[in-house]
Interface confidence: low
């Protein structure tokens, strides 16, 4: 008879999760010479150890510390790009601007991007049927705690001018409840970070409003200024042109505003 299994509201662990994590680790360490020393089996063991056999609503940041330690990586000053609710464009940008990095361009973020995982208390099994949903079940689930942990670390290690890409099409351009608003903003270190520059990405081609005047952006400015970090904001009216100009900065059309 099949053993009773806890039913959660969220989708289950991504199929071939162990193989995917290992394969991504292999690919990442081959492409990034500075991470050549990483033993992918140890990375997987540490990842697994964070959630296997543990009640999936009682995961802590401490559970992920062995993994965080193995995946330690530094980003050069002025090269950190945070994002909120606009992941695809942020990733397209760093794929072109290869010297800037989002969390998903780092080993640990790359391993887990778009994956779901959870285990079960007191068994060595991975639960492929269902995993806890952040809202409906619990916030201390394996996936949410992972992203909170690595996002905190990513923000803590940032230095110089930090950039953040924000989605100007959303009702809350800056959302205090997003990972950026609840974790990263509060873990930027004022002694290392001189400024945060927000890039507000416009959605409609005819949208010429100054979204840097949006109340939520003013709220972000207030939070950042209180932490003794300077704040700048830039409207990106034409994201398609913005990317094109990152690729070809000498293009004559790129000398005008974007």
């Amino acid at each position: 008879l099949p053993r009773w299994r806890q039913q959660w509201s969220g989708s289950g662990t991504t199929s071939r999760f162990p193989e995917t994590v290992l394969a991504r680790c292999v690919k990442y360490t081959e492409v990034h010479p500075e991470m050549r020393h990483v033993d992918c089996q140890s990375v997987w063991d540490a990842f697994k150890g964070a959630f296997i056999s543990k009640y999936p609503c009682n995961i802590t940041e401490e559970d992920y510390q062995p993994l965080v330690k193995l995946g330690t990586q530094t980003v050069p000053c002025n090269k950190t790009l945070l994002w909120s609710r606009i992941k695809d464009l942020a990733h397209q940008f760093t794929q072109v601007q290869r010297d800037m990095f989002t969390l998903e361009d780092m080993l640990l973020g790359y391993l887990a991007d778009d994956l779901t995982w959870c285990g079960e208390f007191n068994t060595f099994e991975i639960n492929y049927q269902s995993c806890p949903d952040w809202r409906k079940d619990c916030s201390n689930n394996p996936v949410s705690v992972f992203w909170k942990t690595v996002s905190r670390r990513f923000a803590e290690t940032a230095c110089g001018v930090v950039h953040v890409m924000l989605n100007g099409s959303r009702s809350k351009i800056f959302d205090k409840n997003s990972t950026f608003g609840s974790v990263e903003v509060h873990n930027l270190q004022p002694e290392k970070v001189q400024a945060l520059e927000a890039w507000v990405i416009h959605g409609g081609r005819e949208d010429s409003r100054d979204l840097c005047q949006d109340p939520t952006i003013k709220e972000l400015e207030s939070i950042i200024s209180k932490r003794n970090i300077r704040f700048f904001c830039k409207n990106i009216y034409r994201p398609d042109k913005f990317l094109q100009c990152v690729k070809n900065p000498e293009d004559s059309s790129c000398l005008s505003g974007i």
Epitope: A23, V26, E30, R36, V38, D39, C40, Q41
Partner: antibody, heavy 123, light 110 residues
Framework: EVQLLESGGGLVQPGGSLRLSCAAS????????MSWVRQAPGKGLEWVSD????????HYVDSVKGQFTISRDNSKNTLYLQMNSLRAEDTAVYYC????????????????WGQGTLVTVSS | QSVLTQPPSASGTPGQRVTISCSGS????????VSWYQQLPGTAPKLLIY???QRPSGVPDRFSGSKSGTSASLAISGLRSEDEADYYC???????????FGGGTKVEIK
């Protein structure tokens, strides 16, 4: 089920060329490094060459450097070994072997093997 | 001449324990993991042990691997007639930038 099927072996004269192929199925081919390992009649195993998941890194045993070329076509799930200037001492069964998911050398092992293809170099 | 050194043969009676040694150097076994393969007559090799002592699923726990310094060993306990085969150790050699095998050990059942 993981399957590796070698082909392209046969009888060739000294100085001749052969191209071995290894068709892979049952796994995500471009997740893995791949290798060629050979075994001369009545002798032990000898690693010949390996290639990383994307073809970006290749390595060869000293005795075949400049003579053999390993390559892969991930769109066709196929591994190749181009063998030139063949000598009698290259006579062997050539096995295609799937590497581990690790690129890091310390963890490299051969998890699955094909049945091999016999290469005979003789006049 | 193989980079890793194994005894050419080993034997035992059914039920006995047989140990095969594999000796290398700091650039291979000393620094890297060891794997073991079984090759039954007329067949392709099969992975028995990886990462020094890990068994792939389906390999009986009669087979065990260990490593100390620049030497490794494979132990077969409760020897059975189907264990009659050639056994090879393998490691990566950092100085050669490639994999290396032992010369193989033929295990015979007396």
């Amino acid at each position: 089920e993981v399957q590796l099927l070698e082909s392209g072996g046969g009888l060739v004269q000294p100085g001749g060329s052969l191209r071995l192929s290894c068709a892979a199925s049952g796994f995500t081919f471009d997740d893995y490094g791949m290798s060629w390992v050979r075994q001369a009649p009545g002798k032990g195993l000898e690693w010949v060459s390996d290639i990383s998941w994307n073809g970006g890194k290749t390595h060869y045993v000293d005795s075949v450097k400049g003579q053999f070329t390993i390559s892969r076509d991930n769109s066709k799930n196929t591994l190749y070994l181009q063998m030139n200037s063949l000598r009698a001492e290259d006579t062997a069964v050539y096995y295609c072997a799937r590497g581990s998911l690790f690129h890091d050398s310390s963890g490299f092992y051969f998890g699955h093997w094909g049945q091999g293809t016999l290469v005979t170099v003789s006049s | 001449q193989s980079v890793l050194t194994q005894p050419p043969s080993a034997s035992g009676t059914p039920g006995q324990r047989v140990t095969i040694s594999c000796s290398g150097s700091s650039s291979n076994i000393g620094d890297n993991y060891v794997s073991w393969y079984q090759q039954l007559p007329g067949t392709a090799p099969k992975l028995l042990i990886y990462r020094d002592s890990q068994r792939p699923s389906g390999v009986p726990d009669r087979f065990s691997g260990s490593k100390s310094g620049t030497s490794a060993s494979l132990a077969i306990s409760g020897l059975r007639s189907e264990d009659e085969a050639d056994y090879y150790c393998q490691s990566y050699d950092s100085s050669l930038s490639g994999s290396v095998f032992g010369g193989g050990t033929k295990v015979e059942i007396k």
